[in-house]
Interface confidence: low
């Protein structure tokens, strides 16, 4: 099959990096400056994401893949494919349509992205508030009272949380 | 006041192409922390989700299934937004909308509206 | 992609009453819900956004509440003008999804 399709198509015979040019009798012909092809048999190149204002280049675009871009410092991806980026706040801070705003008591945020999650429940666990949370920390639990004996301490930080909205790049 | 108003619905072949507008006034399509997404709603169903487009950078993401045969821009001098859908079949009959897009905290929501377009899909 | 189920999908009530709808997320999306308001021919309109905010303007019989899975939209005093259809919206993950709607109508 896809011999008989090379012998229909010459187009198929053209690499990525490169589009079949109708204007030249189905060249296989470079992509110009500025733009790609990732696949081979294409008859256009696509043009190269630009990272533009509080976009950064994170990868350069070459002849057979697109740019990548990052956010500048104090703003971070959202999306997929860094869509967009976002403002940082500070730690113990979430952003809101009014801009930054401390987190409310009883919550907080350990990182410069997402919104405040409150305290973790200790006593949901049985156990006791072996450090206080702050803003920017949560609480960290300990055995109950009464599991306490001389020597013998169980600390497990609570593991951390995905961000909201936020795609895995 | 902001407002968005789409244009260019209508009756279309299976198998053919629309190209929706969406002008956007009362906010500028290159306000940071503002996006615009196209969102449709077929006869009596449910709202769905097509895609984004950051107007500031020209960036866009689609939903998965809508991938490779659409394609959302901007005209920014125009204050103007498109939704290029291609290979329409009968399903994609539905009443079309932008909607602005404010993006914080991580979050997305849909807090204006454009009044909708409708497209018809048949022969 | 996340999928929000909202019940009930229709309900008849009377001017006055409470009235009460529910989404729940397949998976956990924080707080990360907006809650709309569709009326026949028209556009959705934004009520709720992060599961309790009240949007500007909406007024205040609008409540929502939930985090996690579960997310409660309630209208203390049902307004002739808020017989319409109501979806959830989760922003939590990519990409953005609604419930179903439900659609409330006059009993």
């Known amino acids: 099959f896809e011999r008989t399709r090379s012998l229909q198509d010459p187009c198929s015979n053209c690499p990525a990096g490169t589009f079949c040019d109708n204007n030249r009798n189905q060249i296989c012909s470079p992509c110009p400056p500025n733009s790609f092809s990732s696949a081979g048999g294409q008859r256009t190149c696509d043009i190269c994401r630009q990272c533009k204002g509080v976009f950064r280049t994170r990868k350069e675009c070459s002849s057979t893949s697109n740019a990548e871009c990052d956010c500048t410092p104090g703003f971070h991806c959202l999306g997929a494919g860094c869509s967009m980026c976002e403002q940082d706040c500070k730690q113990g801070q979430e952003l809101t349509k009014k801009g930054c705003k401390d987190c409310c008591f009883g919550t907080f945020n350990d990182q410069k992205r997402g919104i405040c999650r409150p305290w973790t429940n200790c006593s949901l666990d049985g156990k006791s508030v072996l450090v206080n949370g702050t803003k920017e920390r949560d609480v960290v639990c300990g055995p109950s009272p009464a599991d306490l004996s001389p020597g013998a301490s169980s600390v497990t930080p609570p593991a951390p949380a995905r961000e909201p909205g936020h795609s895995p790049q | 006041e902001v407002q968005l108003v789409e244009s260019g619905g209508g009756l279309v072949q299976p198998g053919g192409s629309l190209r929706l507008s969406c002008a956007a006034s009362?906010?500028?399509?290159?306000?940071?922390?503002?996006?615009v997404s196209w969102i449709r709603q077929a006869p009596g169903k449910g709202l769905e989700w097509i895609g984004i487009?950051?107007?500031?950078?020209?960036?866009?993401n689609y939903a998965q299934k809508f991938q490779g045969r659409v394609t959302i821009s901007r005209d920014n001098s125009k204050n103007t937004l498109y939704l290029q859908l291609n290979s329409l079949r009968a399903e994609d009959t539905a009443v079309y909308y932008c909607?602005?897009?404010?993006?914080?905290?991580?979050?997305?929501?849909?807090?204006?509206w454009g009044q909708g377009t409708l497209v018809t899909v048949s022969s | 992609d996340i999928q929000l189920t909202q019940s009930p999908s229709s309900l008849s009530a009377s001017v006055g009453d409470r009235v009460t709808i529910t989404c729940r997320a397949s998976?956990?999306?924080?707080?990360?819900v907006a809650w709309y308001q569709q009326k026949p021919g028209k556009a959705p309109k934004l009520l709720i956004y992060?599961?309790?905010n009240l949007e500007t303007g909406v007024p205040s019989r609008f409540s929502g509440s939930g985090s996690g899975t579960d997310f409660t939209l309630t209208i203390s005093s049902l307004q002739p003008e808020d017989f319409a259809t109501y979806y959830c919206?989760?922003?939590?993950?990519?990409?953005?999804?609604f419930g179903q709607g439900t659609k409330v109508e006059i009993k």
């Open positions: 909607a602005r897009d404010e993006y914080y905290g991580g979050s997305y929501y849909f807090d204006y």
């Open positions: 009362g906010f500028s399509l290159s306000t940071s922390g503002v996006a």
């Open positions: 487009i950051n107007p500031n950078f020209g960036d866009t």
């Open positions: 998976q956990d999306v924080r707080t990360a």
């Open positions: 992060d599961a309790s």
């Open positions: 919206q989760q922003s939590y993950d990519w990409p953005p999804t």
